[in-house]
């Protein structure tokens, strides 16, 4: 489909280019030219050039608000790497690094656990998990990881959860949860993942991050 | 249509207790945050507090636990309790419906006046 | 507590004036503040939110501006019914606090 998009894309900018260099020869008075495409050439671009300086006003108006609305609505995005910790927490760490992204000041990553947001909206947050495990040297328990949230002056709690059973592979099986959903956050909110076990979690290149994106 | 009707004000002792009522119509408590806000006479707005969705409530600190929110999800009606009045809680009560994604207040009650004198 | 000061306290305007009202906060609020207009006897009518959005079923004469500590009501041209009390409200930190508000009268 990309490919497509941009055949079609290069195919309008030919066009474009194109009739640019027909009104310049029309202009410069080229034989090969006959009088009536040029008149109807010129006619069409006459005709652009008159919206465009009709439209040049009403945009002149709107422009400061544009820039102020572009301002104030600003795109609101982080993917963060997962990092090994030392700590016994059960909750994931993070950094910014590798082909990590923190759009800007609106959201931030706090104590490398959280992601904290500034502007209360619909945001989409979801994260993956990757863990090696092995069913005789893990308990019973399924392997288990939890997206939660703590918003200012409220409790803590769990927005998505999700359940697998350990590998019989040996010595662990790799397997990947992801988790993603959309909430409302309010301003100061942070988001966060737990998992029943850290020890387990894959921090190769690509297999576990987190992120959010305000819609 | 979206209505929150307040009731239940009206002049109290200092040191007496009264209990606000904020009848809403046109949605339910629990699909959305009702907060109550007041306005003693030639003052600001002040906020109060919120009754979330879920249950959960959430109080301005400087209120000193004098203030309780809950609510009767049958009778889709959000209370606010005070005790220990004070002359300075004479004010316009008003209850008012948050916007959904946003902590602004998009609804709001006529307010009940509650008088706090001896 | 963010402390919010909004002025002017009360001004004086006339039908088709252009009339700008501002509120300073006390810490930057990352855009998270409304607006609400208040007529006597009657409840606040929120006006605009998140700065600059315009709540449903309010005129366009009415648009919000700012960022960091301080923000602006513009009413592009006065009409008869917008002679009323304004407030700005942040609610960027609990507990959330309003401006002590601005009275537009007749001039």
């Known amino acids: 489909h990309r490919r497509l998009d941009k055949i079609e894309d290069e195919r309008n900018l030919h066009e474009d280019f194109v009739f640019m260099k027909t009104i310049q020869r029309c202009n410069t008075g080229e034989r090969s030219l006959s009088l009536l495409n040029c008149e109807e050439i010129k006619s069409q671009f006459e005709g652009f050039v008159k919206d465009i300086m009709l439209n040049k006003e009403e945009t002149k108006k709107e422009n400061s608000f544009e820039m102020q609305k572009g301002d104030q609505n600003p795109q609101i995005a982080a993917h963060v790497i997962s990092e090994a910790s030392s700590k016994t927490t059960s909750v994931l760490q993070w950094a910014e690094k590798g082909y990590y992204t923190m759009s800007n000041n609106l959201v931030t990553l706090e104590n490398g656990k959280q992601l904290t947001v500034k502007r209360q909206g619909l945001y989409y947050i979801y994260a993956q998990v990757t863990f090696c495990s092995n069913r005789e040297a893990s308990s019973q328990a399924p392997f288990i990881a939890s997206l939660c949230l703590k918003s200012p002056g409220r409790f803590e709690r769990i927005l998505l959860r999700a359940a697998n059973t350990h590998s019989s592979a040996k010595p662990c099986g790799q397997q990947s949860i992801h988790l993603g959903g959309v909430f409302e956050l309010q301003p100061g909110a942070s988001v966060f993942v737990n998992v029943t076990d850290p020890s387990q979690v894959s921090h190769g290149t690509g297999f576990t991050s987190f992120g959010l994106l305000k819609l | 249509e979206v209505q929150l009707v307040e009731s239940g004000g009206g002049l109290v002792q200092p040191g007496g207790s009264l209990r606000l009522s904020c009848a809403v119509s046109g949605f339910s408590s629990t699909n959305y945050h009702v907060h109550w806000v007041r306005q003693a006479p030639g003052k600001g707005l002040e906020w109060m507090g919120v009754i979330w969705g879920d249950g959960d409530t959430s109080y301005n600190s400087v209120l000193k636990s004098r203030f309780t929110i809950s609510r009767d999800t049958s009778k889709n009606t959000v209370y606010l309790q005070m005790n220990s009045l004070r002359a300075e809680d004479t004010a316009v009560y008003y209850c008012?419906?948050?916007?959904?994604?946003?902590?602004?207040?998009?609804?709001w009650g006529q307010g009940t006046l509650v008088t706090v004198s001896s | 507590d963010i402390q919010m000061t909004q002025s002017p306290s009360s001004l004086s305007a006339s039908v088709g004036d252009r009339v700008t009202i501002t509120c300073r906060a006390s810490?930057?609020?990352?855009?998270?503040l409304a607006w609400y207009q208040r007529k006597p006897g009657k409840a606040p009518k929120l006006l605009i939110y998140d700065t600059y959005r315009l709540a449903d079923g309010v005129p366009s004469r009415f648009s919000g501006s700012g960022s960091g500590t301080d923000y602006t009501l513009t009413i592009s041209s006065l009409q008869p019914e917008d002679f009323a009390s304004y407030y700005c409200?942040?609610?960027?930190?609990?507990?959330?606090?309003f401006g002590q508000g601005t009275k537009v009268e007749i001039k």
């Open positions: 409200q942040q609610y960027y930190k609990f507990p959330f606090t």
């Open positions: 008012a419906r948050q916007l959904t994604h946003y902590y602004v207040l998009a609804a």
């Open positions: 810490e930057d609020l990352y855009y998270n």
